[in-house]
Interface confidence: low
């Protein structure tokens, strides 16, 4: 088949006001092409136009959302053009307000286990899209469940591997405007844990401190971890520090917690800069307890 291949860079999901490059590649090496839009609003800058190699489209508006195909120049064809390419659907985000994205039971998922990603909104979206950062393939399309308070979808993801870990966002859309999406949800980092041996966690001056006293938690390992992550049980988010090689041959990071007022169970994880969403087993939990009133200085 002499069909060319149409692709979108950096991806098919484009924020309103941003740009997208449509690239048409011919197996026969012809670099001139025409573009057509099959649905949605017309885009006048495509009409009767011949492009070379690629077309930088934007700043995009909801009018740019829709299905595109290209035809490459083909001197041996009766029309002078190839057959139409594969379709590329450009989705424009920012048209509706953003939904929320949550992970159950949480965003840190043991290797091999399953996590449920829940996207919900007070807008009645019939469709949701789930998109992983850095992936150019089409996002996952999911059917929303409508209810009085809005809409939601649950997506079960697993068994967990480093290939599934990453930064996720979800979008909502309504049936009559399928390619016009909401603003993206806040990003959700899904991390696979348990890929490497656990680091150790200790406290200076100790795990029991006076209220208002400074405490530093040290995470260390003989593994060549670049980064350590410190998390507190029942709290979202984590602290992140670069590891430093110590004289004794361990890689360590010191987390100064400052004047503490509340105790809690802490754990730390190690990871490598090249695989930011793949972490070690957690350290053994370190309970930090706070006693008495803050010391008068």
């Amino acid at each position: 088949q002499d069909k060319p291949f149409l692709s979108a860079w950096p991806g098919t999901v484009v924020s309103e006001g941003q740009h997208v490059t449509l690239q048409c590649r011919s197996r026969l090496g012809f670099n001139e092409f025409s573009l057509s839009k099959e649905d949605g609003m017309p885009v006048p800058e495509l009409y009767n136009r011949i492009f070379r190699n690629s077309f930088l489209m934007g700043p995009v508006t909801p009018a740019h959302a829709g299905t595109y195909r290209c035809c490459s120049s083909h001197p041996h064809s009766p029309t002078g053009w190839s057959a139409p390419s594969n379709p590329v659907v450009i989705m424009v985000t920012g048209v509706h307000r953003k939904p929320s994205l949550l992970a159950h039971p949480g965003p840190l998922v043991k290797s091999g286990e399953t996590v449920i990603l829940q996207c919900w909104s007070d807008v009645r979206f019939e469709r949701f899209l789930l998109h992983r950062e850095g992936i150019t393939e089409d996002p996952l399309r999911l059917v929303g469940q409508l209810h009085d308070a809005g809409s939601q979808v649950n997506y079960s993801m697993g068994p967990m591997t480093p290939a599934l870990a990453g930064t996720y966002r979800c979008f909502g859309s309504v049936t009559h405007l399928p390619y016009e999406l909401s603003a993206p949800s806040d990003p959700l980092d899904i991390v696979v844990v348990g890929l490497y041996g656990k680091p150790s966690l200790s406290a200076q001056p100790g795990p029991t401190v006076q209220a208002g006293e400074n405490v530093t938690l040290s995470c260390s390992s003989r593994s060549l971890f670049d980064i350590y992550h410190l998390s507190r049980e029942a709290e979202a988010g984590e602290l992140r520090l670069t590891a430093v090689l110590r004289v004794n041959g361990t890689f360590q990071a010191n987390f100064p917690l400052g004047p503490v007022t509340h105790g809690g169970n802490y754990r730390c994880f190690g990871s490598f800069r090249a695989l930011p969403h793949a972490w070690s087993d957690p350290s053994d939990p370190l309970p930090v307890s706070v006693t008495g009133n803050s010391r008068n200085l």
Epitope: W9, Q18, Q23, E45, Y47, N53, S54, L56, G58
Partner: antibody, heavy 119, light 107 residues
Framework: ELKLEESGGGLVQPGGSMKLSCVAS????????MNWVRQSPEKGLEWIAE??????????HYAESVKGRFTISRDDSKSSVYLQMNNLRAEDTGIFYC??????????WGQGTLVTVSA | DIQMTQTTSSLSASLGDRVTISCRAS??????LNWYQQKPDGTVKLLIY???ILQLGVPPRFSGSGSGTDYSLTISNLEQEDIATYFC?????????FGAGTKVELK
């Protein structure tokens, strides 16, 4: 605020070399094909060279009058585009502007830098 | 290469006048015609692209029209700040080419 700032112009002898630089700010530089356009009293405005995006493998195109003598390059990390000019001729004299290309036009222009080729 | 011809190199007009500048391409450029304004200090600004679409921030007294090979730029009500040289440019085919310019002066 959107800005394009050309530099590197000046007086050069025929056969000499010169490198022009242009620093951009206020727009997503890496999303735009970048161009150099020259203006002279004899030839008016004249498109000189174009460099495309990383996704286009930084493909370049040149006007016939400068092919083989001029080289356009870019550094997206510095939002900069360059024009290396070798074997300069008197007819290369003019004001050189760097400008991004969008759709079919050059939407933003800098103040230009003057290149004078003279003995 | 596509040649762009602006037959009028300069014209004189009074403030408030309607001014039309024409541009002809040596072959059909499918409406990929742009107009630029260059002020006496050398500043270049895109006014109109794709024959008739006003660039953001350009006042509506400027308009463009044409098709095929013949295009024009109209200033409906000339103002002092419009005193400049106007260039047409085709964006249909490499190499992109410009007209020689039309200088608008005050009578």
């Amino acid at each position: 605020e959107l800005k394009l700032e050309e530099s590197g112009g000046g007086l050069v002898q025929p056969g000499g070399s010169m490198k022009l630089s242009c620093v951009a700010s206020g727009f997503t530089f890496s999303n735009y094909w970048m161009n150099w356009v020259r203006q002279s009293p004899e030839k008016g405005l004249e498109w000189i060279a174009e460099i495309r995006l990383k996704s286009n493998n930084y493909a370049t195109h040149y006007a016939e009058s400068v092919k083989g003598r001029f080289t356009i390059s870019r550094d997206d990390s510095k939002s900069s585009v360059y024009l290396q000019m070798n074997n300069l001729r008197a007819e290369d004299t003019g004001i050189f502007y760097c400008t991004p290309f969008y759709g079919s036009s050059f939407p933003y222009w800098g103040q230009g830098t003057l290149v004078t080729v003279s003995a | 290469d596509i040649q762009m011809t602006q037959t009028t190199s300069s014209l004189s007009a009074s403030l408030g006048d309607r001014v039309t500048i024409s541009c002809r391409a040596s072959q059909d450029i499918s409406n990929y015609l742009n107009w630029y304004q260059q002020k006496p200090d050398g500043t270049v600004k895109l006014l109109i692209y794709y024959t008739s679409i006003l660039q953001l921030g350009v006042p509506p007294r400027f308009s463009g029209s044409g098709s095929g090979t013949d295009y024009s730029l109209t200033i409906s009500n000339l103002e002092q700040e419009d005193i400049a040289t106007y260039f047409c440019q085709q964006g249909n085919t490499l190499p992109f080419t410009f007209g020689a310019g039309t200088k608008v002066e005050l009578k």
